[in-house]
Amino acid sequence: MAVTACQGLGFVVSLIGIAGIIAATCMDQWSTQDLYNNPVTAVFNYQGLWRSCVRESSGFTECRGYFTLLGLPAMLQAVRALMIVGIVLGAIGLLVSIFALKCIRIGSMEDSAKANMTLTSGIMFIVSGLCAIAGVSVFANMLVTNFWMSTANMYTGMGGMVQTVQTRYTFGAALFVGWVAGGLTLIGGVMMCIACRGLAPEETNYKAVSYHASGHSVAYKPGGFKASTGFGSNTKNKKIYDGGARTEDEVQSYPSKHDYV
């Protein structure tokens, strides 16, 4: 029972985590304009892995995709790769773990097979979580570096009077979503690995017992039988809740005007 609960909980936690990783990857707010110097700016900039956006106080938001691959910083490419690898591994892990769930009966699948699948999905979740955490952390480090670099030359004097303010970027909501989601996926993976240990059949070797029948002296020496055949081990009716991540890009723009991509 505890094994089933641990496995189920691990699956649900990983599911939420992977949904979060997908959401974070799709979000535009990986880095947001630092408003320390100008808290009442009329133009607010924020950037994601796939596009950068500008929100005006008028309510109009313009987003532009990064339509180049070669022109992008290597670090950004690396973060993209880490997040995609995390999502792919997580998705495969979810698929494997669905079949590995103790509460789901698939043909005559042995518990040993379920244990192996549980371990495989657990490892996949751990790696997926680590990829997401690594991706977000690399991006955060890149932001910190750029932040202090831009602070160093924040005001470039031009002709004494005129000031050119350099836009600084700080941590966006997506980073926190990514860290939490990566952590959840990691925890879910660990839980799956723990559940695997409980699922793995132990070799039960019975001591040789002599049965003396009248008139015959026959000794039965049973070998190590498998603990379970894979049937009827869990007849309880359990519900599986399947969740999905949906990210909505709320881009407010006015009707009857040009579309800006």
């Epitope: 700016t41 009329a42 133009v43 106080s57 008028s58 109009f60 532009r64 005007k257």
Partner: antibody
């Protein structure tokens, strides 16, 4: 057709109060940020206050902060400017304007004159 | 606050001429996020409210004749009126649309000889 009509102007004593209204029509009022801008022959155009489409955030010019309050009633398509502790330098033509692309003002009302004098 | 300085204060022209007026800001109005300059131009005729001409420094508002052209970047901006017409005689204001408080220039008055 977009229309903005201001009302509520008039002669006010120094230290007195006045509430200006701006009735909007011809567009989805709740979808746009709105402003009050004033004009005097001496100072020219001066931005006064801003209220976003959802009533938050609100910004004020330093010269009116703490004395003026901008608000809106989206169901009634009306913008307000509550003015208190009025000074002679607040004498001006007050316009309401709609916020637009590029943080510009694409539609202005005809204005309402507020005169602060003893 | 961003200070907007317009020059000249008065411009006397003859119909059909090309005219240019300048607007300088104390701080750059170029937004790095979209490479757009947050400067707006307005035209105001006597007894009327200002009318939007150009936003994003060079984007003409619909219905504005193409003889009006906005240019410039960063801190220096120009409004050019080609083939000036009698109906163009008005006050022209530039506005900082980059940060609050939204500030206006003192204006350039266009007059006919």
């Amino acid at each position: 057709d977009v229309q903005l009509v201001e009302s509520g102007g008039g002669l006010v004593q120094p230290g007195g109060s006045r509430k200006l209204s701006c009735a909007a029509s011809g567009f989805t009022f709740s979808g746009f940020g709105m402003h009050w801008i004033r004009q005097t022959p001496e100072k020219g155009l001066e931005w006064v206050a801003y209220v976003s489409s959802g009533s938050r955030p609100i910004y004020y010019a330093d010269t009116v902060k703490g004395r003026f309050t901008i608000s809106r009633d989206n169901p009634k398509n009306t913008l307000f400017l509550q003015m208190t502790s009025l000074r002679s330098e607040d004498t001006a033509m007050y316009f309401c304007a709609r916020f637009y692309y590029g943080n510009s003002f694409d539609h202005w009302g005809q204005g309402t004159l507020v005169t602060v004098s003893a | 606050d961003i200070v907007m300085t317009q020059s000249p204060s008065f411009l006397t022209v003859t119909a059909g001429e090309k005219v240019t007026m300048s607007c300088k800001s104390s701080q750059s109005l170029l937004n790095s996020g979209n490479q757009k300059n947050y400067l707006t131009w307005y035209q105001q005729k006597p007894g009327q409210p200002p009318k939007l001409l150009i936003y994003w420094a060079s984007t003409r508002e619909s219905g504005v004749p193409d003889r009006f052209t906005g240019s410039g970047s960063g801190t220096d901006f120009t409004l050019t009126i080609n083939n000036v017409q009698a109906e163009d005689l008005a006050l022209y204001y530039c506005q900082n649309a980059y940060s609050f408080p939204l500030t206006f220039g003192a204006g350039t008055k266009l007059e006919l000889t």
